[in-house]
């Protein structure tokens, strides 16, 4: 566990010609705030895909009014750091999105108006516990200067916040084979000798490879809480107690959501649904009124004139959450056809089509026959994003360029002999059979199962199959 910290140093016009107009005016004073979104790895995700590592919103900056005729200066910034707590290991590589938002403070109906001023994004490698890294990013004519770092929360240490430190048991030195925990020299690196998977919160070990449970926990890895309602809770380090097991703890155990927020588990971690008046990763930000512009994504704020009265965000279609901060998963309906990949960009759905398909929902099957000829009188048939040739008799292969052997499939029945012919095949039937493929027996009395043979053909003669 740890915290990613972002410090915004300046936001203003970038170098070069074409300085941007000030986002604020005497008629429309405004103030800035920032949003950061973090994702693990260096993946090429859509900007609007979930902030799996977390997200944070800054406070509002000071109100700024443009001085008439003056160029747009660096704009006044909010105080403090943006902090994104992360629950698990720090991934080392991450993607970030930093958005600069403008809040207009004119006399809008329903509270202040919001608009996105700039968005920058990047991918970085960063070890936890290292120094501040400085960065400059440009978005159009704007320039954003910032620093960032990742730091571990005790007792975690290390570049991924996965090593644990414990206070020294002896004042002078660490135990055998254990190093001091830099930079916490008064602490020692915890021995990683317990059984693999042993719960760091509810288990401990005194011998390598064991996992002993604290009171109230059981199971081989001390991950199963002991129910006190149906049995006696054993004192001290427990063993598994029959009939007393309930499901093991999840990310919502102990409810990490503050201020009455409700917790729901996600595949990676947890998500808090906050009551009105609170927001943030753990519903920790409070005292919000409509004047603070708490409704994201064009949501309309109603009520909440003072910090003690609740506000309500009326969300536009496609957004939800107490602050309209969450997008409805429209891709779950799988609108993209033919195996296309769905991307929900908020303002629109996009489909990334597989080869051979096009259109807003990959609904057009591209005609791969265009510009491709099938040889020797073959006709092109399109389907599935690929073309194939339906070949004329006597030809085969992808483009009908290969001369087919019509006898390869042994088409002549009852021992008839097959002869390739320029326009097909000819079967020479064995005695007692007739027909184009020798499929009809000749009856012993001389009559056949067919009407009389066509003039000029006697039973037993080769029959040409056209």
């Amino acid at each position: 566990a740890g915290v990613f910290e972002l410090q915004i140093h300046s936001f203003g016009p970038g170098p070069g010609p074409g300085a941007p107009r000030s986002p604020c005016s005497a008629r429309l004073p405004c103030r800035l705030f920032f949003r950061v979104c973090l994702k693990p790895g260096l993946s090429e995700e859509a900007a609007e895909s979930p902030c799996a590592l977390g997200a944070a919103l800054s406070a509002r900056g000071p109100v700024y009014t443009e001085q008439p005729g003056a160029p747009a200066p660096d704009l006044p910034l909010p105080d403090g750091l943006l902090q994104v707590p992360f629950r698990d290991a720090w991934p080392g590589t991450f993607s970030f999105i930093i958005e600069t938002w403008r809040e207009e403070l004119g006399d809008q109906i329903g509270g202040p108006a919001w608009s996105l001023l700039a968005r920058v994004a990047g991918r970085r490698r960063l070890a936890a516990g290292g120094p501040w890294a400085r960065d400059i990013q440009r978005a159009g004519a704007w320039e954003l200067r910032f620093s960032y770092r990742a730091r571990c929360e005790p007792p975690a240490v290390g570049t991924a916040c996965t090593r644990l430190c414990r206070p020294r048991s002896a004042p002078s030195r660490c135990g055998p084979g254990l190093r001091p925990c830099a930079p916490l020299e008064d602490e020692c690196e915890a021995p990683l000798v317990c059984r693999a998977g042993c719960s760091p919160e509810h288990g401990f070990c005194e011998q390598p490879g064991e996992c002993r449970c604290l009171e109230g926990w059981t199971g081989p890895l001390c991950t199963v809480p002991v129910s006190t309602s149906s049995c006696l809770s054993p004192r001290g380090p427990s063993s598994a107690t029959t009939g007393c097991l309930v499901p093991g703890p999840g990310p919502c155990d102990g409810n990490p959501c503050a201020n009455g927020g409700s917790c729901s588990e996600t595949p990676r971690s947890f998500e808090c649904t906050c009551p009105r008046g609170f927001y943030g990763l753990r519903c920790e930000v409070s005292g919000v009124t409509c004047a603070d512009g708490p409704c994201f994504n064009g949501g309309l704020c109603v009520g909440g004139a003072d910090p003690d009265s609740a506000y309500i965000c009326h969300c536009p279609p496609g957004f939800q959450g107490s602050n309209c901060e969450k997008r409805v998963d429209r891709c779950s309906l799988q609108p993209c056809r033919n195996g296309g990949l769905c991307l929900d960009l908020g303002h629109a759905l996009r489909c990334r089509c597989r080869a051979g398909f096009a259109g807003p929902r990959c609904e057009h099957d591209l005609d791969d026959c265009a510009g491709r000829a099938c040889a020797n009188g073959g006709t092109c048939v399109e389907g599935g994003g690929a073309h194939r040739c339906s070949c004329a008799l006597g030809f085969g292969g992808r483009d009908c360029r290969e001369r087919a052997d019509p006898c390869a499939a042994r088409p002549c029945a009852h021992g008839g002999r097959c002869y390739a012919h320029f326009s097909g095949l000819v079967c020479a039937c064995a005695p007692g059979y007739m027909g184009a493929r020798c499929e009809f027996p000749v009856h012993p009395d001389g009559a056949s199962a067919l009407p009389a043979a066509p003039p000029g053909l006697r039973p037993g003669d080769p029959q040409r199959y056209l």
Epitope: L333, Q334, P335, L349, P360, R361, E363
Partner: nanobody, 120 residues
């Protein structure tokens, strides 16, 4: 502009049934995908059942075997037959449609929602 009008919501006892309807009207060239989402109090809006862009039916795990989605293409309408209703099925049910308004232009539309309450 396309309108989606839902109907059929109401209050029912556990184990009971309801049938929701959603009719699409307006400038519709064709309907690409259409289905039902629900939003329970304090929860996220989630897909319940729908017809995908490829015309397949899709159901949330929690409703499989209890809910059935059907459609009348001539009327641009989808139906959700809900049986063996449970308390956790309570919520506002929203119709959603991904609609081609002409051959190459498609947009997503939501209905206003219809409330389903399951209580003894």
């Amino acid at each position: 502009e396309v309108q989606l009008v839902e109907s059929g919501g109401g209050e029912v006892q556990p184990g009971g049934s309801l049938r929701l309807s959603c009719a699409a009207s307006g400038s519709i060239f064709s309907i690409n995908a259409m289905g039902w989402y629900r939003q329970a109090p304090g929860k996220q809006r989630e897909l319940v059942a729908g017809f995908t862009g490829d015309g397949m039916t899709k159901y949330a795990e929690s409703v499989k075997g209890r809910f059935t989605i059907s459609r009348d293409n001539a009327k641009n309408t989808v139906y959700l037959q809900m049986s063996s209703l449970r308390a956790e099925d309570t919520g506002v049910y929203y119709c959603a449609a991904d609609v081609f308004t002409d051959r190459d232009h498609v947009d997503w539309y939501w209905g206003q929602g219809t409330l389903v309450t399951v209580k003894p």
